[in-house]
């Protein structure tokens, strides 16, 4: 413990005191305050000034100040969360979601309560990614695009486009080539093969899905329907 | 806060249509985020989904094959609101009625956040 | 259509106790299940989203486990204010479906 070295004063008729300092009631004088790290151990007098005390471990002071006692830090960062900021002396522990979560309810510094990010299903991609504070959300694939996969970042993909469609599109599958040369790469003479996927997804019953190959339909499910002609609001 | 306010008529006459409207208020009827639902429960069906309107770029419906043929959900943006319409009543649409916002669709965590009040539509002569 | 059935459809229970009611999926559905709560005149209200998250401001008595067809929905310790009727809801394809109900006594 160590005391400012300053004699308090009385403040002018009308006036106010200087930077770091308060007016104290009791004392009816301009007395120090103490710095962030530290909290008035004894309140001044009309002769001494305020006696300052470094914070205990695990409680903090982040502004100049005369509060009794230091302020506890928060709890540690629950397992969904990772600390940003440490709690010392001088500023308490900040906890933020940690990578594939978003702050679902937010307090004055940190997260209190953090929340998985939204996975698009297939035939769904990412409309608005996630961000520190707000969900993914997601938007059916369009015609001639497909999403095949459960993830927070994928956007719906164009199909690719074949010289011959075994098997045409829809939104959760890309079309299948049999083709030599389909528009995106692959070895010579191969059959494209999209990745296996369930078709269980957010989708209307099965109807003929959208082709980028003229004539052709094939069963499965596909995206939802705009509204029938004459809805309002588009 | 969002709150959904029910209205429409609660008896209907068989082969009639019948209409209900969904006013808003908390949320916008084009959010991108949110669906717009109905649904209905009654003592023979329990709680049954009729359908949903949503906007991400352009509008979308889908609707429950058991009522797609009578069946239409649209959204009001200058109201804030959205409606359904069930053509050709009978009997067995005797139920209450609930309008619904839908968080998530297409993705993880998709479900009934906030629902109306509930009407009571009864069909009979 | 995804048929939900649930068991039992009724129960009763005295406060304090364990309540369990279990939803079964004709189909695989992965976690794509709710859970609500719906009182006596009143809309249904989410407690539980896929499977076992909690809707914030739910009381931490209430919990949900389970997979693929097999869902546990649980109450750790019976309130008065818990007597309700409970509803397990799909979304994992169109339609979206409910159980048919579970409804809940105090003894």
């Known amino acids: 413990p160590r005391a400012v070295a300053f004699t308090p004063y009385a403040p002018e008729p009308g006036g106010t005191c200087r930077l770091r300092e308060y007016y104290d009631q009791t004392a009816q004088m301009c007395c120090s305050k103490c710095p962030p790290g530290q909290h008035a151990k004894v309140f001044c007098t009309k002769t001494s000034d305020t006696v300052c005390d470094s914070c205990e471990d695990s409680t903090y002071t982040q502004l100049w100040n005369w509060v009794p006692e230091c302020l506890s830090c928060g709890s540690r960062c629950s397992s969904d969360q990772v600390e940003t900021q440490a709690c010392t002396r001088e500023q308490n522990r900040i906890c933020t979601c940690r990578p594939g979560w978003y702050c679902a309810l937010s307090k004055q510094e940190g997260c209190r309560l953090c929340a998985q990010l939204r996975k698009c299903r297939p035939g769904f991609g990412v409309a608005r990614p996630g961000t520190e504070t707000s969900d993914v959300v997601c938007k059916p694939c369009a015609p001639g695009t497909f999403s095949n996969t459960t993830s927070s970042t994928d956007i719906c993909r164009p199909h690719q486009i074949c010289h011959v469609v075994a098997i045409p599109g829809n939104a959760s599958m890309d079309a299948v080539c049999t083709s030599t040369s389909p528009t995106r790469s692959m070895a010579p003479g191969a059959v494209h093969l999209p990745q296996p996927v369930s078709t269980r997804s957010q989708h209307t019953q099965p109807t003929p899905a959208p082709s980028t190959a003229p004539g052709t339909s094939f069963l499965l499910p596909v995206g939802p329907s705009p509204p029938a002609e004459g809805s309002t609001g588009d | 806060q969002v709150q959904l306010q029910q209205s429409g008529p609660g008896l209907v006459k068989p082969s009639q249509t019948l209409s209900l409207t969904c006013a808003i208020s908390?949320?916008?009827?084009?959010?991108?985020?949110?669906?717009w639902n109905w649904i209905r429960q009654s003592p023979s069906r329990g709680l049954e989904w009729l359908g949903r309107?949503?906007?991400?770029?352009?509008?979308?419906?889908d609707y429950a094959l058991s009522v797609k043929s009578r069946i239409t959900i649209n959204p009001e943006t200058s109201k804030n609101q959205f409606s359904l319409q069930l053509n050709s009543v009978t009997p067995e649409d005797t139920a209450v009625y609930y309008c619904?916002?839908?968080?998530?669709?297409?993705?993880?965590?998709?479900?009934?956040?906030?629902w109306g009040q509930g009407t009571l539509v009864t069909v009979s002569s | 259509d995804i048929q939900m059935t649930q068991s039992p459809s009724s129960l009763s229970a005295s406060v304090g106790d364990r309540v369990t009611i279990t939803c079964q999926a004709s189909?695989?559905?992965?976690?794509?299940l709710n859970w609500y709560q719906q009182k006596p005149g009143k809309a249904p209200k989410l407690l539980i989203y896929?499977?076992?998250n909690l809707e914030i401001g739910v009381p931490s008595r209430f919990s949900g486990s389970g997979s693929g067809t097999d869902f546990t929905f649980t109450i750790s310790s019976l309130q008065p204010e818990d007597i309700a009727t409970y509803y397990c809801?799909?979304?994992?394809?169109?339609?979206?479906?409910f159980g048919q109900g579970t409804r809940l006594e105090i003894k």
């Open positions: 619904a916002r839908e968080d998530g669709v297409g993705g993880t965590k998709d479900y009934f956040d906030y």
């Open positions: 908390g949320d916008s009827v084009s959010s991108n985020s949110a669906a």
């Open positions: 309107t949503y906007y991400r770029s352009k509008w979308y419906n």
């Open positions: 189909q695989d559905i992965d976690n794509y």
């Open positions: 896929d499977v076992s």
């Open positions: 809801q799909q979304y994992d394809n169109l339609p979206l479906t």
